[in-house]
Amino acid sequence: MSSKYPRSVRRCLPLWALTLEAALILLFYFFTHYDASLEDQKGLVASYQVGQDLTVMAAIGLGFLTSSFRRHSWSSVAFNLFMLALGVQWAILLDGFLSQFPSGKVVITLFSIRLATMSALSVLISVDAVLGKVNLAQLVVMVLVEVTALGNLRMVISNIFNTDYHMNMMHIYVFAAYFGLSVAWCLPKPLPEGTEDKDQTATIPSLSAMLGALFLWMFWPSFNSALLRSPIERKNAVFNTYYAVAVSVVTAISGSSLAHPQGKISKTYVHSAVLAGGVAVGTSCHLIPSPWLAMVLGLVAGLISVGGAKYLPGCCNRVLGIPHSSIMGYNFSLLGLLGEIIYIVLLVLDTVGAGNGMIGFQVLLSIGELSLAIVIALMSGLLTGLLLNLKIWKAPHEAKYFDDQVFWKFPHLAVGF
């Protein structure tokens, strides 16, 4: 069977993507300029390193983490890079328009690139739920809608709830998870006969997914501390994230063994559970006052992640059509909620300790913030899902789900690559 890219997409994708890129270039030309102030070069290098860590997380970490499908590993990695590159460009412009535009020009700094990379990361988390069932043209739509929704959510939360960069960005876990799950819910669900093998994992792609997990594991402290404004807060965030992810690795591997009748370790469980602590500790990483608390949180997160990986895929596969190995969506949704609950608990403790009263009001505000993030994620996810179902995108036929050969040129076209 010929595996050429469908003719219609061959017309649609380059035109759509290159027109969009040309539009972005024009927007950058008219509305942006670099920060021209003299800065301490050492500080500049240190600032760049944080951005570099985030890019490594996005391109290598999330890129490879989603590459465990037997027949869809190339697409997972490369499509991730494509989305990251596009998402960062749009996020820089959007953040600038939302926060700086009254002054007429968007000033681009290393910090704005850092923010944009984190916004683009949201898409890479969400897309795990739909990779293999959509083409690049559809992914472009998903990037634009999700980055726009997240940017607006952050601005609204900042203005209504008076929160800083870190707090309004840490809703990314919950936002990305629910966005991805609601998009997946809109897409055709049942896997047609004869494609069941394609959404299974294979040894070499699973190894590359583990490599992705390792990169994420190493750089998660950078992600959680990137938007904190003082050295002491960053130090706390780095330490607490490190303790949490360290414990979640131990919990993931031992918990995975415990969950298997023969005591065997599941690759899929481990891929995502090693990151559990980092997600759960994200919102409050700078606030947790002692290592043991971060470690307990890592333990709980690891157990939730393994438990979720064991019992939720069946449900997700039936209801949302998400394959068993794409567990980032429901994993992040649970762990993101755990992180938000921990933050609310810490807020209550602070209010009680300071003797300032109004505990109920503070809790209500935090729940309002979280609810807003979930509602906007679900609404914008459903909107995206509906858009992706439009015929104009020439979505892959269901028989071509999870198949690199639909998108890539393989000179040999060897059977069972």
Epitope: D35, E39, D40, G43, L44, A46, S47, V50, T109, L110, F111, R114, S158, N159, I160, F161, N162, T163, D164, Y165, N168, R229, S230, P231, I232, E233, H286, L287, P289, L346, L347, L349, D350, T351, V352, G353, A354, G355, N356, F361, Q362, L365
Partner: antibody
Framework: EVQLLESGGGVVQPGRSLRLSCAAS????????MHWVRQAPGKGLEWVAV????????EYADSVKGRFTISRDNSKNTLYLQMNSLRAEDTAVYYC??????????????????WGQGTLVTVSS | AELTQSPGTLSLSPGERATLSCRAS???????LAWYQQKPGQAPRLLIY???SRATGIPDRFSGSGSGTDFTLTISRLEPEDFAVYYC?????????FGQGTKVEIK
């Protein structure tokens, strides 16, 4: 002893530029966020801009966005405020202030614990 | 969040109790509210941070309280050196904002 010393103020015509400096001593400058705050004659305090400890991020009041640029040189322990397209309403005493972060019960508190003595900028034709 | 201080001017005698109010247009974390004192020709001086914690070297006659949108600075017994202008200030998301100030003057 912590000291912040502003300089660079003076009389300038509308539309022209001026650059303020704030020399810091007595503390590790590179670990603190730094702010500019101004006070028009007979008026209250108005926050102008902040730069994070590592210079990675800068934030501005809407009234100065696009005209003022805050920067720092951690190797020289100096904070700067480049003021372009000055207007009459920019006439004020400009203070630099150090932002300290301290832990409360759980949350972190922020405060301007040290201020410079101020430098007067007069924008007049 | 905009901060509104009241009253604009407070005329009291030494030894009296002064209560200064600061109201925010939206809820702010008490960790992010501070009070400053400014005397003519001088730079502001930090009095209270985190809504209720006294800064180093500040006498215990100064106390702060409140949460949400309503905050209060109390001077239990006014001393002659306490007659000055007092500002509340908040930070949550940018921008940082100051109240318009309350002038405490001798009656």
């Amino acid at each position: 002893e912590v000291q912040l010393l502003e300089s660079g103020g003076g009389v300038v015509q509308p539309g022209r530029s001026l650059r303020l400096s704030c020399a810091a001593s007595g503390f590790t400058f590179s670990t603190y966020g730094m702010h500019w705050v101004r006070q028009a004659p007979g008026k209250g305090l108005e926050w102008v801009a902040v730069i994070w400890f590592d210079g990675s991020n800068k934030e501005y009041a809407d009234s100065v966005k696009g005209r003022f640029t805050i920067s720092r040189d951690n190797s020289k322990n100096t904070l700067y405020l480049q003021m372009n397209s000055l207007r009459a309403e920019d006439t004020a005493v400009y203070y630099c202030a150090r932002e300290e972060v301290v832990r409360g019960v759980i949350l972190w508190s922020r405060k301007f614990d040290y201020w410079g003595q101020g430098t007067l900028v007069t924008v007049s034709s | 969040a905009e901060l509104t201080q009241s009253p604009g001017t407070l005329s009291l005698s030494p030894g009296e109790r002064a209560t200064l109010s600061c109201r925010a247009s939206q809820s702010i974390s008490s960790s992010y509210l501070a009070w400053y004192q400014q005397k003519p020709g001088q730079a502001p001086r930090l009095l209270i941070y985190g809504a209720s914690s006294r800064a180093t070297g500040i006498p215990d006659r100064f106390s702060g309280s409140g949460s949400g949108t309503d905050f209060t600075l109390t001077i239990s017994r006014l001393e002659p050196e306490d007659f000055a202008v007092y500002y509340c200030q908040q930070y949550g998301s940018s921008p940082w904002t100051f109240g318009q100030g309350t002038k405490v003057e001798i009656k």
